[in-house]
Structures are given as structure tokens and as C-alpha cells.
Interface confidence: medium
């Protein structure tokens, strides 16, 4: 399986909400001994590999933001903790999973990573991740709504 990031860059005005999205692609093993652990974290574009370093998002760790289920089942994080920080991560039945960040500030700018770990409980882990950049802008040059740039090209889309 693979993880696709529909958008590689999100440019948003301060105070706006944004939903960062990843998609789980390919065949998904639904065996009883397979678990999919999905989560989000901040990172940096490391010299060795992007997304290798896991930093908290608004003080919430990858463990706090994880989604647990088998295959393409829907799930969401512990609401109370995340929502106190203006965050919510969720997934649907089609392999899409996302994190919504509310009331963006300049401090939210940076690289965000979604991580999927396929855990075969008596053998190994297989992990894949996707990376996307969030730029929060303020002032006269800031867009009125979030603008997203697809990963495959630099055509932008306005989202409200």
C-alpha cells in the first residue's frame, strides 16, 4: 500500500481553519492479525529523510493524535484532548484520513506528516508517510481563504 497526499502545500490566512489530508492507496490486508496505526506529527525536511523526526502538533504527540482500526474503517481521535488544542483527526471508509486545525496562527507554519503503520502482529511493521507544507500568512499579502497546491502540479485551488 501507499500513502498519497492530494496537496503538497497549503497557504492559509491567520485565523482560518484548515484540513490536511492523506489517502491510503492500494490493497489493504484486512486480516485479524493486521492493525493500521494512523497518526499525524510535525517534522522537518531532514538531510536523510523527510518526516523521520516526529515533533508534536500544538503540544500533542503522535500518540495523542493516532487513529486506530483495521483496514478502511472510520475512526477519530480522542475528542476532548485534541479539541482543547483546536485539533481533530479523522478517517473514513475510503482510506482518506485528515487532521483539522482551527484558528491558525503563524506558529502553525511548517511541515506536517501523516503516518500509516501496518502492523503484522507476529512478523513486522511496514510504515509509509506523506508530507505536506502549511504556510500561515498574515497582512495584506495573505489570501482570504486557504489556497491548496496539488502534489502533481502547481495549479492552485481555493478552499473555504
Amino acid at each position: 500500500f501507499k500513502v498519497a497526499t492530494p496537496y503538497s502545500l497549503y497557504v492559509c490566512p491567520e485565523g482560518q481553519n484548515v484540513t490536511l489530508t492523506c489517502r491510503l492507496l492500494g490493497p489493504v490486508d484486512k486480516g485479524h492479525d493486521v492493525t493500521f496505526y494512523k497518526t499525524w506529527y510535525r517534522s522537518s525536511r531532514g538531510e536523510v529523510q523527510t518526516c523521520s523526526e516526529a515533533r508534536p502538533i500544538r503540544n500533542l504527540t503522535a500518540a495523542d493524535l493516532h487513529l486506530h482500526h483495521g483496514g478502511h474503517q472510520a475512526a477519530n481521535t480522542s475528542h476532548d484532548l485534541a479539541q482543547r488544542h483546536g485539533l481533530e483527526s479523522a478517517s473514513d471508509h475510503h482510506g482518506n484520513f485528515s487532521i483539522t486545525m482551527r484558528n491558525l496562527t503563524l506558529l502553525d507554519s511548517g511541515l506536517y506528516c501523516c503516518l500509516v503503520v501496518e502492523i503484522r502482529h507476529h512478523h513486522s511493521e511496514h510504515r509509509v508517510h506523506g508530507a505536506m507544507e502549511l504556510q500561515v500568512q498574515t497582512g495584506k499579502d495573505a489570501p482570504s481563504n486557504c489556497v491548496v497546491y496539488p502534489s502533481s502540479s502547481q495549479d492552485s485551488e481555493n478552499i473555504t
Partner: antibody, heavy 117, light 107 residues
């Protein structure tokens, strides 16, 4: 910050079952995988096995026939049972938390278990 | 089972010196390798995960490198509190395994 505390008898007789409990505080038991790791006196570390809050388990094959790890989400606890113990099972037993794909980032302080008659 | 071999078994150095610890895997673990520090009577403490990433709160004098089968933990300038036993651990396959440890002692 998540904290872990092991508890259980410090002395177990040969052929009996060693039972330990790890209590999780300061975080959700559903956020991590939970492992048991042991360290015989003066020796290195050995991973025993893990459990997830859903009940999924994975054990070290060298101990699998004797190990059971269980979880009680209502008490935020997970437990280790090791049957038919011998003197070779004398060790400090640690519980640890583990975010899949990363590493054991939080450990209990450890509890010494001596197997002796 | 993946076997991790650490060398040297003991490293005798003085404060301020550079320490270089090695961990070799019996088969490739990609970069799925962690390093821990353990002091007498204490639980291990995570230093490095994924071969080269420092865990939260770990000083910059600790650095990790390598991939595949050969890994190195470097302590650029030893502080008195760094004298301890260091373990590597792989998590690409189960069972999860640790190296036998390297003791860094005061010369």
C-alpha cells in the same frame, strides 16, 4: 506526561507463575502499544511482548509458550503472566510504552523479581 | 531473529573526549534502530530513534548515524553524567531485539 508503575511480588517460587501489573497514568491507554521488557542481573535487555488496548498481542517466540499479556482499559492497566518460572527468569521487569514505528520512549522504574524456593 | 552486536563491550574514556559506539545487525534493519542509555539502578532512557533522530530533551552532543546493518552512536564530548551503559535496539522485525550493550566508563 505518561507515567508507568510496575507492581507485583518480588519473590516467586520455581514452577509457579510470575504475575506483574503496570499502571498507566497521565495519558490514554489507547494511545500506545504496551510492552514488557526484562533484564537479568548484570545482563542485557530482552523484549517479552506487547499488547494494544484492543487486545492484539505479540510475544517473543523464546517465551511465547509461557507468556500471557492482558489489558484492563477500565483500570488503565496491563499485566504480565509468566508460567513455569525458573531461576533463569530472575530479572528486573520493566513495562514500557511504544508508539508504533518509533521506540520505547517511556519506561516504568522496573521491579526486581527473584525466582527462588 | 535479528542479532545486534555492539562494540566495544567497554569503552574507557575521560570527560571531554569523544565516544564512538558501534552496533552491527545480522541483517538489514533499514534505519529502524534506536539507542538507549542506562545508568545503574535506573530504567533505560531513549536517546535516538530511527538511527539519527534525538528524542525529546536529549542534548545535541548525542548523535546517531548509519543505516542497513552498521550504526554508530557518537557522544561528541563526554560529560560526567554520560558514563553509563548504551544499548541499541531494532524494530523492523519481531521479536524486537537489543544489542548486548557498551559500557562507557571513566578512564
Amino acid at each position: 506526561q505518561v507515567q508507568l508503575q510496575e507492581s507485583g511480588p518480588g519473590l516467586v517460587k520455581p514452577s509457579e507463575t510470575l504475575s506483574l501489573t503496570c499502571t498507566v497514568s497521565g495519558g490514554s491507554i489507547s494511545s500506545y502499544y504496551w510492552s514488557w521488557i526484562r533484564q537479568p542481573p548484570g545482563k542485557g535487555l530482552e523484549w517479552i511482548g506487547y499488547i494494544y488496548y484492543s487486545g492484539s498481542t505479540n510475544y517473543n517466540p523464546s517465551l511465547k509458550s509461557r507468556v500471557t499479556i492482558s489489558v484492563d482499559t477500565s483500570k488503565s492497566q496491563f499485566s504480565l503472566k509468566l508460567s513455569s518460572v525458573t531461576a533463569a527468569d530472575t530479572a528486573v521487569y520493566y513495562c514500557a510504552s511504544d508508539i508504533p514505528a518509533f521506540a520505547f520512549d517511556i519506561w516504568g522504574q522496573g521491579t526486581m523479581v527473584i525466582v527462588s524456593s | 531473529e535479528i542479532v545486534l552486536t555492539q562494540s566495544p563491550a567497554t569503552l574507557s574514556l575521560s570527560p571531554g573526549e569523544r565516544a564512538t559506539l558501534s552496533c552491527r545487525a545480522s541483517q538489514s534493519v533499514s534505519y529502524y534502530l534506536a539507542w538507549y542509555q542506562q545508568k545503574p539502578g535506573q530504567a533505560p532512557r531513549l536517546l535516538i530513534y530511527d538511527a539519527f533522530n534525538r528524542a525529546t530533551g536529549i542534548p545535541a552532543r548525542f548523535s546517531g548515524s548509519g543505516s542497513g546493518t552498521d550504526f554508530t552512536l557518537t557522544i561528541s564530548s563526554l560529560e560526567p553524567e554520560d558514563f553509563a551503559v548504551y544499548y541499541c535496539q531494532q524494530r523492523i522485525n519481531w521479536p524486537l531485539t537489543f544489542g548486548g550493550g557498551t559500557k562507557v566508563e571513566i578512564k
